[in-house]
């Protein structure tokens, strides 16, 4: 019917059981297992009152039957500028959930691709308004993943104040546009995060110690664009002790070659940087100046490309992008489709792998999955994967700790908290803790061997080109060495 | 209730046109993406055509491209698909549907309107 | 273009048992965690109706014995227990992206 709107959780894909806690003690006399979850001691500073706080939200969300039982949801604020809008000429907004006794500020950046001409933009509209108009937004979200507020499933920062702020504006967070004859649509992305940013000072922002901008996808490019002018922003407000960070989830893709090349018609199988090139001029979008002074006008593009844009950065940013990302391979047009694949497919699949682990090896804080997925951080089962024995939620804590101890000049990490995560196995989901499989016909989860054999994936002669037994060769591939 | 009619089908001899309209009530029409899919006899359904909600972009598909013609008038709440050089093809039950803009799901359908091509 | 191929063409189940229709797409058509696969009925002489919207969210009105599942490229429909007024012909379709299409259609028969 009219204006029906399916609010689902993100990623779909069913996850294995939970990984057990990280840190765990036996309750007295029972030989039974408690959960211990780290308070959020950067935010209490000799400050009694927010340190009790945290203690009462703690208490609370370990005590189910609690009157005060905790509210996962966060509250939709529209923009009080109503002149910073979403495609449509709607208000712009975000999603709040306040919390008084932390002084860590996470606000996430909404994926989910971008149209680059009045033509996709006509059909985006139609078909997926909701990332073009706040006008049927409802008026609360749940946080999940890196968003929730209950230790178990953010164990990494469950007691900060989370924002959501939806991608309504299709130009990669990039845009600066406003609406002219010429545009029947706007393109605000950069603008609105500058106005999120500006309204939540009045919110409790101003106090913060830390903002962490995060995203996925589009998102996680959005970061990328604009971590930089977010810091400076502040600095220029008068708030230069706000600590600004990037966390990219999922939004560094690469101008490689397209497995087959495909003219620019639509926005999934256009190849990125055409795609890019053209909507820049589109949406009037904007990249950060110490990038786009390294290439001549016309070749902001590059910009977009984490690999490219990321030397060029003053704040920290911890980059989270699965080695097999299924947006890059659509946009590659190698996307698995279940089909068995021909052997150049999965020449081009492993190499890109490859290539990917190439441009994170100078990223010192990184977690790049052997998996085929696409993102991550706000799944509720974001906790489950690891790379090397570490989780992500494990990882941006050392991340935190390196940056607290005043590490980020050394190259020397901190003892025992890995934070340059990259898997070197070379097959998708190769790594046995990647998100479950599942043949997608019987719904029964398949093991890796399983994966591969079922997408056409010839033992024999891998294990001859490796020089190995394939029994051997399965065997590593079920371990995931 | 929200409803869509098509009307304009007939016998129509090759080489010849045709206009078929779609008149919808009972929402606010100028909020949809329109569509029109066809169904030769005994054959499956086949995607014609798109009209974005402004009117601004038309869509079509190979088969039909450079032969049809799609507008909307906003105002008057109709959908019209002008077919020229008409083909032994092109005989088929033509609907009418909407798409949904929360995933472009075509949730309200017309009762179609049948065209032969035939001399 | 998005091509969907729909299988079987055909298929005869018992009445209460479950009747399973696949289809696959010739590239993903899931995006920022929606996967853009449409499931309709038709029955003879009159217009399809839809079922299931967005892989796997049910239209209202539609009977719980249908449901759907799948992301990425491989998509199901499930229909369970069968009923005799289920006999019908099922269509899949894709919105990802233009231009939109469909599947050849599965004709189920209630033996």
């Known amino acids: 019917g009219e204006g029906r709107k399916t609010w689902r959780r993100r990623g779909q894909q069913p996850a294995p059981a939970p990984l057990p806690p990280q840190r765990t003690e036996a309750a007295p006399g029972t030989g039974q297992p408690v959960e211990s979850f780290p308070l959020d001691f950067t935010a209490v500073e000799g400050n009694m009152d927010s340190f009790m706080a945290q203690v009462k939200s703690l208490a609370q969300s370990l005590y189910p039957c609690s009157a005060q039982q905790l509210n996962e949801d966060l509250r939709l604020h529209l923009l009080l500028n109503t002149s910073v809008t979403c495609n449509d000429g709607s208000p712009a907004g975000y999603y709040l959930k306040e919390s008084k006794g932390s002084r860590r500020w996470l606000l996430f950046l909404e994926g989910g691709w971008y149209c680059f001409s009045r033509e996709n933009c006509d059909s985006r509209y139609d078909t997926m308004r909701r990332l073009m108009s706040s006008k049927d937004w409802p008026q609360t979200r749940t946080g999940t993943g890196i968003l929730s507020s209950q230790p178990e499933e953010n164990p990494y920062w469950w007691n900060a104040n989370m924002v959501f702020i939806p991608y309504c504006s299709s130009d990669v967070w990039s845009g600066a546009s406003s609406k002219s004859e010429k545009n029947e649509y706007v393109f605000m992305g950069a603008l609105i995060i500058r106005e999120v940013v500006q309204e939540l000072l009045g919110r409790g922002l101003s106090g913060a110690k830390v903002l962490l901008l995060a995203g996925s996808s589009a998102g996680g490019t959005g970061v990328l664009l604009n971590v930089d002018r977010v810091a400076e922003q502040l600095e220029q407000l008068g708030y230069p002790a706000i600590q600004v960070r990037g966390l990219a989830d999922s939004g560094w893709f690469l101008d490689n070659k397209q497995y087959r090349r495909t003219d620019c018609v639509d926005t999934v199988t256009c190849a990125p940087t055409e795609a890019i090139r053209r909507g820049i001029r589109y949406w009037n979008g904007m990249v950060p100046e110490r990038c786009r002074s390294q290439f001549k006008e016309g070749e902001e593009w590059n910009c977009f490309l984490g690999y490219k844009v990321y030397p060029t950065l003053r704040c920290p940013v911890f980059v989270v992008q699965w080695l097999f990302d299924e947006a890059q391979l659509t946009a590659d047009n190698a996307h698995l489709t279940g089909q068995p694949v021909q052997e150049g497919q999965w020449l081009y699949i492993q190499n890109l792998g490859h290539e990917l682990r190439n441009t994170l090896k100078d990223v010192p804080a990184s977690f790049a999955p052997a998996c085929l997925s696409h993102e991550i951080i706000i799944r509720s089962h974001w906790t489950d994967v690891q790379v090397k024995g570490t989780s992500l939620p494990r990882a941006l804590h050392c991340w935190d700790r390196s940056l607290h101890d005043s590490h980020k000049a050394s190259k020397t990490p901190l003892k025992g908290c890995p934070i340059h995560l990259v898997d070197s196995c070379p097959w998708p989901h190769c790594n046995p803790s990647c998100p479950t499989i599942r043949d997608q016909f019987t719904g029964q989860e398949m093991n890796v061997a399983q994966f591969l054999m079922h997408m056409g994936f010839d033992v024999q002669t891998v294990a001859q080109q490796q020089g190995l037994e394939p029994s051997k060769l399965l065997g590593m591939l079920s371990s995931g060495s | 209730d929200v409803q869509l009619l098509e009307s304009g089908g007939g016998l129509v001899q090759p080489g010849g046109s045709r206009k078929l309209s779609c008149a919808a009530s009972g929402f606010t029409f100028s909020d949809f993406g329109m569509h029109w899919v066809r169904q030769a006899p005994e054959k499956g359904l086949e995607w014609v055509a798109y009209s974005s909600s402004g009117g601004t972009t038309v869509y079509y598909a190979d088969t039909v491209k450079g032969r049809l013609t799609l507008s909307r008038d906003n105002s008057k709440n109709t959908l019209f698909l002008e077919m020229t050089s008409l083909r032994s093809e092109d005989t088929a039950m033509y609907y009418c549907?909407?798409?949904?803009?929360?995933?472009?799901?075509?949730?309200?359908w017309g009762q179609g309107t049948s065209l032969t091509v035939s001399s | 273009d998005i091509v969907l191929t729909q299988s079987p063409a055909s298929l005869a189940v018992s009445l209460g048992q479950r009747a399973t229709i696949s289809c696959r797409a010739s590239k993903s058509v899931s995006t920022s965690g929606y996967s853009y696969i449409h499931w309709y009925q038709q029955k003879p002489g009159q217009p399809p109706k839809l079922l299931i919207y967005l892989a796997s969210d049910l239209e209202s009105g539609v009977p719980a014995r249908f449901s759907g599942s799948g992301s990425g490229a491989a998509f199901t429909l499930n229909i369970h227990p069968v009923e005799e007024e289920d006999a019908a012909t099922y269509y899949c379709h894709h919105s990802r992206e233009l231009p939109f299409t469909f599947g050849s259609g599965t004709k189920l028969e209630i033996k």
């Open positions: 549907a909407r798409a949904s803009y929360d995933g472009g799901y075509f949730d309200c």
